[in-house]
Interface confidence: low
């Protein structure tokens, strides 16, 4: 979370003299406060925008706009904050609005844009303007808040940013799954244009419940350039209990621009649906036990096992 | 312009501590992992320690394990390296360095003394 | 942990010689490694990344060549201001180990 580098931050309009400042998000309202205080803003638009940077870099920005109420208020307005707060982190930036000349009503209603807050793929955000001055601490809030969901690498917009080109946004491994003969499962996917190797994995559950009843890796060496674009195939023998069916096939690749935080393609395929008809096994082929954990290497990013941002289902 | 820039080195006494950091501009510092890199005098290059884009994987030198810790700020553009319980082999030239896409190390500050002695 | 080895140590040649710098790993690291190039008192620089793929801006008389545990650094024509002391580096996995380097300079 971070302002845009190198744009002239510019609020004026005709009929306005303003000024962007860098904020500290806290505004001195809330220590000297005012009696008469501005209305809140009528309603806020938060949408995706993708900006270059003077490093010519594709960053995906929010585009914020809100527009005022058209009450008397605005005679008392003075400026407004921005802030942006990324949830998981609790990471919070401000800017603030600072109004030169007051606001007169005129023939329609006033409408404020900011399209510098550089954001990351796959995080949401708050986005809260707040009128200036802030109310006296009983007063009526004058603020509106909305949160935004940035989408993924895996989304058009998204893919051609440097920070989702650099986790490896622009593969598609177009992955494929054939179950064979005698508990064996074959992946297939296609290798992107670097020398890098990529690794496989995958885990089996059973249908019934979410318990992960096999696990295991398997490394695919770098390719060699007359390999790139081409179908890479991994076949791994399956548990011999039946009852562990579902299988989720993880395939990560080790680009050089992202090493062990490259995204991550997935597929998952379920247990075969069994008939009516179907004699049941015995009993004790149900006991959950477990097999041995393999294949694992120092590849293995164990912190981001589980965590959905760097799997991409399709 | 890319650049990186490190400070916090310095002279410190056998089992000190020292706190490097590495400022970095002109690139989405967020979307790149980074190592750091010694010299000592007269002597060739040593890895010391890595750390990805989001601080999930982290790499050290067998060297340095155990003493040195390596860190991130990516709100603040920092790379860091805590080094503990340092010893006279730690006396070096320590780089801040930003791995290629493709492969390598593209981008390396000028490097800051550190100077271990009693 | 695979070892990086370099040879020579170091070597000294006339302006205009053939300049051949060899590296080789204890182990297989397929095209995972980078050269670098010191001058005296400076920061290294990448020259050749992925084996063989010249860093831009990095003048054409060095090449790189090899896969696996050998590789090789050549200056098809030395120049003065080719002294320095080159590195190799795997960057395959962890450690990220570097060679001992090669010192160069000219007769």
């Known amino acids: 979370l971070r302002l845009l580098d190198h744009r002239a931050l510019v609020c004026s309009q005709p009929g306005l003299n303003c000024t962007v400042k860098n904020s500290t998000c806290l505004d001195d309202s809330w220590i000297h406060p005012r009696n008469l205080t501005p209305s809140s803003p009528k309603n806020i638009y938060i949408n995706l925008s993708v900006s270059s940077t003077q490093h010519g870099e594709l960053v995906p920005v929010l585009h914020v706009e809100w527009t005022l109420q058209t009450d008397a208020s605005i005679l008392y307005l003075e400026g407004a904050e921005l802030s942006v707060l990324q949830l998981n982190t609790n990471e919070r930036l401000c800017v603030r609005f600072e109004f030169l000349s007051k606001l007169r009503h005129h023939h329609r209603r006033w409408r404020f844009t900011f399209s510098h807050f550089v954001v990351d793929p796959d995080q949401e955000y708050e986005v809260t303007v707040h009128h200036l001055p802030k109310p006296i601490p009983d007063g009526d809030p004058n603020h509106q808040s909305k949160n935004f969901l940035v989408p993924d690498c895996e989304h058009a917009r998204m893919k051609v940013t440097t920070p989702c080109m650099s986790s490896g946004s622009l593969w598609d491994p177009n992955i494929t799954v054939e179950t064979l003969e005698a508990h064996q499962l074959r992946v297939s996917f296609t290798l992107w244009n670097e020398s890098t190797p990529y690794q496989v994995l995958l885990e089996s559950f059973s249908d019934s419940e979410n318990h992960s009843c096999f696990d295991v890796v398997k490394q695919i060496f770098a390719p060699r350039q007359e390999e790139f674009h081409q179908r890479a195939n991994v076949t791994f023998t399956l548990s011999k209990f039946h009852w562990c069916c579902h299988h989720h096939v993880q395939v990560q690749p080790f680009f050089s621009s992202c090493l062990n935080d490259c995204l991550r393609h997935a597929v998952t395929v379920p247990c075969p649906v069994i008939s009516n008809t179907t004699v049941p096994k015995p009993v004790a082929d149900y006991i959950p036990l477990w097999e041995p954990r393999s294949g694992s290497s120092d590849y293995k990013d164990d912190d981001d096992k589980g965590s959905s941002h760097h799997h991409h289902h399709h | 312009e890319v650049q990186l820039v490190e400070s916090g080195g310095g002279l410190v006494q056998p089992g000190g501590s020292l706190r490097l950091s590495c400022a970095a501009s002109g690139f989405t510092f967020s979307s790149y992992s980074m190592n750091w890199v010694r010299q000592a005098p007269g002597k060739g290059l040593e890895w010391v320690s890595f750390?990805?884009?989001?601080?999930?994987?982290?790499y050290y030198a067998d060297s340095v394990k155990g003493r040195f810790t390596i860190s991130r700020d990516n709100a603040k553009n920092s790379l860091y390296l805590q080094m503990n319980s340092l010893r006279d082999e730690d006396t070096a030239v320590y780089y801040c360095?930003?791995?290629?896409?493709?492969?390598?190390?593209?981008?390396w500050g000028q490097g800051t003394t550190v100077t271990v002695s009693s | 942990d695979i070892q990086m080895t370099q040879s020579p140590s170091s070597l000294s040649a006339s302006v205009g010689d053939r300049v051949t710098i060899t590296c080789r790993a204890s182990q297989g690291i397929s095209n995972y490694l980078a050269w670098y190039q010191q001058k005296p008192g400076k920061f290294p620089e990448l020259l050749i990344y992925?084996?063989?793929t010249l860093q831009s801006g990095v003048p054409s008389r060095f090449s790189g060549s090899g896969s696996g545990t050998d590789f090789t650094l050549t200056i098809s024509s030395l120049q003065p201001e080719d002294v320095a002391t080159y590195y190799c580096q795997k960057y395959n996995r962890a450690p990220f180990t570097f060679g001992p380097g090669t010192k160069v300079d000219i007769k």
């Open positions: 360095a930003r791995p290629k896409v493709g492969g390598g190390m593209d981008v």
């Open positions: 992925a084996a063989s």
């Open positions: 750390i990805s884009a989001r601080s999930s994987t982290i």
